[in-house]
């Protein structure tokens, strides 16, 4: 089958600090040296890009400075972390992998990770 399979966890719960991490793993049909990883958020059938990074195999994954994502790569596996999440950001986060170089190009789209974010309760005022 001339396609690339991408695996990611079905559900992840963000920490109380609004940080969610998950692994995106792809089965590469070719020997790619340049890979692009994009995190997409799907809500009400609308898809928006959360963050994206291109990396050379063996090198670190670098997102833009103002990105809410960080990540590390190891072989065909990418460890993604999204920070600054709030309850309203709860949704389906899709991992998209593209083998950019050398040819042929391959596209791989995961089924998505449902990230649940619960805003922490505000600390009650202390009475002294």
């Amino acid at each position: 089958c001339k396609a690339m399979h991408v695996a990611q966890p079905a559900v992840v719960l963000a920490s109380s600090r609004g940080i969610a991490s998950f692994v995106c793993e792809y089965a590469s049909p070719g020997k790619a040296t340049e890979v692009r990883v994009t995190v997409l958020r799907q809500a009400d059938s609308q898809v928006t890009e959360v963050c994206a990074a291109t990396y050379m195999m063996g090198n670190e994954l670098t997102f833009l400075d103002d990105s809410i994502c960080t990540g590390t790569s190891s072989g065909n596996q990418v460890n993604l972390t999204i920070q600054g999440l709030r309850a309203m950001d709860t949704g389906l986060y899709i991992c998209k992998v593209e083998l950019m170089y050398p040819p042929p190009y391959y596209l791989g789209i995961g089924n998505g990770t449902q990230i649940y974010v619960i805003d922490p309760e505000p600390c009650p005022d202390s009475d002294f």
């Epitope: 089958c1 001339k2 396609a3 690339m4 399979h5 049909p29 340049e34 692009r36 994009t38 997409l40 898809v47 928006t48 890009e49 994206a52 291109t54 998209k96 593209e98 950019m100 170089y101 040819p103 042929p104 190009y105 391959y106 596209l107 789209i109």
Partner: antibody
Amino acid sequence: QVQLVESGGGVVQPGRSLRLSCAASGFTFSSYGMHWVRQAPGTGLEWVAVIWYEGRNKYYADPVKGRFTISRDNSKNTLYLQMNSLRDDDTAVYYCARAGDLGAFDIWGQGTMVTVSS
Amino acid sequence: EIVLTQSPGTLSLSPGERATLSCRASQSVSSSYLAWYQQKPGQAPRLLIYGASSRATGIPDRFSGSGSGTDFTLTISRLEPEDFAVYYCQQYGSSPWTFGQGTKVEIK
């Protein structure tokens, strides 16, 4: 609104050159791969070329390889197709199309006609 | 290169009837990367279905897609006058990007 508008088509003699442009608006141009697709009169759709994101990676269909060059200027939100050594069988309507977030071609321009004839 | 073959070449139907269009791939295509487009004379193609079965924004629910592996289907449950057009399938999971030759749905 999200829009693609092609220009630059016309009538040209075999062996000559032409440059097509595709002006994008309403979306973050640099975040999307951009394709050229053509359609010869009375026939189906044929993929021509793609350029990705920052413009480093490009792919071409075999019939145009070595003759056509795809490029983009992200600061101007514009896609280009430089067509050299044009042949009769390059006669077609040329469309630019956006590769959507999930890969399919979700936005298309209206097309520009290129006629190669002596 | 993945070759897509569409059938029939032409489908002659009346408004209100059901249209079933077929797209067969020369090798297995993941359903995530199969799209259908509609094209009317003098117009650009329009994305109808992506991922084999997901409707694009603004596409009425009379259009539906199905299939996996090498066999895919586009169904129009009840043809409206504006649905008479040419339909193309496409695979976009790997280069080169390829289209089927098209199926023309015409008024009987």
